[in-house]
């Protein structure tokens, strides 16, 4: 049997907050992989995306059934051996976010900026409110860039 750090690289162990716990593996170990040690427990076959083990696997090789994640609250997007699904992300309106695509059993929530908010980084954890211009707009605010304002005293063409 393999140690807890020797698992199939295609399989992700997942905790309850939607966080993947990645394990290291060598090619030789992967070829001989029969199951997975997880916290002293041994699983033979993973659950498919959208499901989790009904309980932790045991040392004696007892193989729990896979059960669905809670729709709209939890998900798993990879095959895994955990008894916990991943928690769906909340699009926190206090961080300027709203739901773009709802969470499903196999896909986490996708968030976007709320109207009149923008985010200019690749991964948006927080959106900022678009600037309101006092002296006119050069360029409207978009999801990825702030408003460009005219300066005081500048003439419009």
């Amino acid at each position: 049997r393999l140690s807890s750090k020797s698992v199939n690289a295609q399989v992700t162990d997942i905790n309850s907050k939607g966080l993947e716990l990645r394990k290291t593996v060598t090619t030789v170990e992967t070829q001989n992989l029969e199951g997975l040690h997880h916290d002293g427990q041994f699983c033979h076959k993973p659950c498919p995306p959208g499901e989790r083990k009904a309980r932790d696997c045991t040392v004696n090789g007892d193989e729990p059934d896979c059960v669905p994640c809670q729709e709209g609250k939890e998900y798993t997007d990879k095959a895994h051996f955990s008894s916990k699904c991943r928690r769906c992300r909340l699009c926190d309106e206090g961080h300027g976010l709203e739901v773009e695509i709802n969470c499903t059993r196999t896909q986490n929530t996708k968030c976007r900026c709320k109207p009149n908010f923008f985010c200019n980084s690749t991964v948006c954890e927080h959106c900022d409110p678009c600037t309101k211009c006092e002296h006119g707009i050069i360029k409207e605010c978009t999801l990825t860039s702030n408003t460009k304002c005219k300066e005081e005293g500048s003439r419009s063409n």
């Epitope: 907050k17 966080l19 993947e20 609250k73 992300r89 909340l90 699009c91 206090g94």
Partner: antibody, heavy 121, light 111 residues
Framework: QVQLVQSGAEVKKPGASVKVSCKAS????????MQWVKQAPGQGLEWMGE????????NYNQKFKGKATITVDTSTSTAYMELSSLRSEDTAVYYC??????????????WGQGTLVTVSS | DIVLTQSPSSLSASVGDRVTITCKAS??????????MNWYQQKPGQAPKLLIY???NLESGVPSRFSGSGSGTDFTLTISSLQPEDFATYYC?????????FGQGTKVEIK
């Protein structure tokens, strides 16, 4: 401003139940999950469970399953936490707290003032 | 459950001192480069107050003398110049895994 106001202190006999309320104001109640945290006298903080007010979905710390029941009344923007079969070890201050999410990191940004529940015969 | 151990359990310091509190997790609370650690301050008879979220983000309205750092299993809360109102108990809290857990607390007292 965002505020959570909890019900007053309670003294209960062993075996009884108690229901603590937490009234929210200053924000859209259904947009944020509500958390409950226990603090025994002179002790640290212990997470009990949470509720999504938009659909009443609950998630409990295994330790408090069967002991605590969390509910909401969206018409009054109030969350409730009921403790059953009270014992002396349930004597504690109970806090409600608003949940926030920063890229799946969940944290508690606004707290109620706490409700002291004393269990004594 | 993830166990968080804070050190020291208590410390005595003077106004103006730089104070460092550490929080060690029994397993990593990181994912994909993000750290799922939060810090709270609690004064006697009061509710906890959020200081830092996601390891290093300062909550709105919290003085900039408070800062958080760390990753994996080791995290630090630093108060750059201790003020009279900072004498309190500080808690770390992880949200990487259910049940969410808190450290046992660090009491900062006046020297």
């Amino acid at each position: 401003q965002v505020q959570l106001v909890q019900s007053g202190a309670e003294v209960k006999k062993p075996g009884a139940s108690v229901k603590v309320s937490c009234k929210a104001s200053g924000y859209t109640f259904t947009s944020y999950w509500m958390q409950w945290v226990k603090q025994a006298p002179g002790q640290g903080l212990e997470w009990m469970g949470e509720i999504d007010p938009s659909d009443s979905y609950t998630n409990y710390n295994q330790k408090f399953k069967g002991k605590a029941t969390i509910t909401v009344d969206t018409s009054t923007s109030t969350a409730y936490m009921e403790l059953s079969s009270l014992r002396s070890e349930d004597t504690a201050v109970y806090y409600c707290a608003r949940n926030r999410d920063y890229s799946n990191n969940w944290y508690f940004d606004v707290w109620g003032q706490g409700t002291l529940v004393t269990v004594s015969s | 459950d993830i166990v968080l151990t804070q050190s020291p359990s208590s410390l005595s310091a003077s106004v103006g001192d730089r104070v460092t509190i550490t929080c060690k997790a029994s397993q990593s609370v990181d994912y994909d480069g993000d750290s799922y650690m939060n810090w709270y301050q609690q004064k006697p008879g009061q509710a906890p107050k959020l200081l830092i979220y996601a390891a290093s983000n300062l909550e709105s309205g919290v003085p900039s003398r408070f800062s958080g750092s760390g990753s994996g299993t080791d995290f630090t809360l630093t108060i750059s110049s201790l003020q009279p109102e900072d004498f309190a108990t500080y808690y770390c809290q992880q949200s990487n895994e259910d049940p969410r857990t808190f450290g046992q607390g660090t009491k900062v007292e006046i020297k």
